[in-house]
């Protein structure tokens, strides 16, 4: 499957926007360092289909939309970023959705791949459940955005490789 | 390969001004802070302050805040640091390190080979 | 500011030999805490990183563990190259600060 040129640019689009999206300096936020426990080796594409990386990387959009669609994240971030950041994600989710039905095809179930999916969704959980104990501080959505920003660089040389593959 | 590297080392007279560069290669500049340490000659480390490069937000230690400034342009992938009117007490070798910033990962694990800057009249 | 202490300031060791440093904080600094060596004219390395977590590359002879105010790094069998200095320094709060060092020399 090939994923569009705009698909490399909405990312780099994404980043930019979670850059901007910064209210706070950093520098008041160290205290809050929190280990999130990235799921590097779902990342670690040496023994990866590549319908089980499109899958991680739908999971792991998602989630950063879930995560920043909360009425804490509009409360907390500016809405006309998050605005333009839904819109990123939303046309990621579309292009990786396409990529799934052709490397995947219908028959497959995405259950296939439900460790790595899992493991994705208890890193959100553990994103989530730190906001909630920070009781969404402002150096909270700090660590968050910083760390999204990480995973979602991630992502992004994952796609690169697999693009590097084809 | 991640590689910090500084600009060679420097011989001023006292009340000269100084801007040494620290160029960061092999990762992405902007997703790590740069902090700046000094080592006088025969003594330890001293954390002088730090840059987020992404947009040049600075943070110092009290005993460096204004009489160092700390820069970077990203476009270049360096950072800096910098004197206005230097004293012989600055004789010291400098290093630039990255950290990760509200990343958990490892703190300055790449370090600058080091600039050595000697004041005297 | 979160001050940092370190002991001994210097021992006198053999190859082979375990060797312990420790470092104590004025104040909590939940873990963030990472050890460093330095050989003369040479930039420092970093060993260990939040304590106990080995840096990538490192000798497993070098371990780190504690936390709160006390934190140790201990070389289980010294090797001819671990003769150097090394700091402790903390990352929890700015400004940032290092131990005043231990020196590691020959016996």
């Known amino acids: 499957c090939d994923l569009p040129q705009t698909h490399s640019l909405g990312n780099r689009r994404a980043l930019i926007l979670l850059a901007q999206m910064r209210r706070i300096s950093p520098f008041s936020c160290l205290k809050d360092r929190h280990d999130f426990e990235f799921p590097q080796e779902e990342f670690d594409d040496k023994q990866f289909q590549k319908a089980q990386a499109i899958s991680v990387l739908h999971e792991m959009i998602q989630q950063t939309f879930n995560l920043f669609s909360t009425k804490d994240s509009s409360a907390a971030l500016d809405e006309t970023l998050l605005d333009e950041f839904y819109i990123e994600l939303d046309q990621q989710l579309n292009d990786l959705e396409s990529c799934v039905m052709q490397e995947v095809g219908v028959i497959e179930s995405p259950l296939m791949y439900e460790d790595s999916i899992l493991a994705v969704r208890k890193y959100f959980q553990r994103i989530t459940l730190y906001l909630t104990e920070k009781k969404y501080s402002s150096c909270a959505w700090e660590v968050v955005r910083a760390e999204i920003m990480r995973s979602f660089s991630l992502s992004i040389n994952l796609q690169k490789r697999l693009k590097s593959k084809e | 390969e991640v590689q910090l590297v500084q600009s060679g080392a420097e011989v001023k007279k006292p009340g000269e001004s100084l801007k040494i560069s620290c160029k960061g290669s092999?990762?992405?500049?902007?997703?790590?802070?740069i902090g700046w340490v000094r080592q006088m000659p025969g003594k330890g480390l001293e954390w002088m302050g730090i840059?987020?490069?992404?947009?040049?937000?600075?943070a110092y230690s009290p005993s460096f805040q204004g009489q160092v400034t700390i820069s970077a342009d990203k476009s270049i992938s360096t950072a800096y640091l910098q004197w206005s009117s230097l004293k012989a007490s600055d004789t010291a070798m400098y290093y630039c390190?990255?950290?990760?910033?509200?990343?958990?990962?490892?703190?300055?694990?790449?370090w600058g080979q080091g600039t050595l800057v000697t004041v005297s009249s | 500011d979160i001050q940092m202490t370190q002991s001994p300031s210097s021992l006198s060791a053999s190859v082979g030999d375990r060797v312990t440093i420790t470092c104590r904080a004025s104040?909590?600094?939940?873990?963030?805490l990472n050890w460093y060596q330095q050989k003369p004219g040479k930039a420092p390395k970093l060993l260990i990183y939040?304590?106990?977590s080995l840096q990538s590359g490192v000798p497993s002879r070098f371990s780190g563990s504690g936390s709160g105010t006390d934190f140790t790094l201990t070389i289980s069998s010294l090797q001819p190259e671990d003769f150097a200095t090394y700091y402790c320094?903390?990352?929890?709060?700015?400004?940032?600060?290092f131990g005043q060092g231990t020196k590691v020399e020959i016996k």
């Open positions: 390190a990255r950290h990760p910033g509200l990343n958990w990962a490892p703190d300055f694990d790449y």
């Open positions: 092999g990762y992405s500049f902007t997703s790590y802070w």
């Open positions: 840059i987020d490069p992404s947009d040049s937000d600075t």
């Open positions: 104040q909590s600094i939940n873990g963030v």
């Open positions: 939040f304590a106990s």
């Open positions: 320094q903390q990352s929890h709060d700015f400004p940032l600060t």
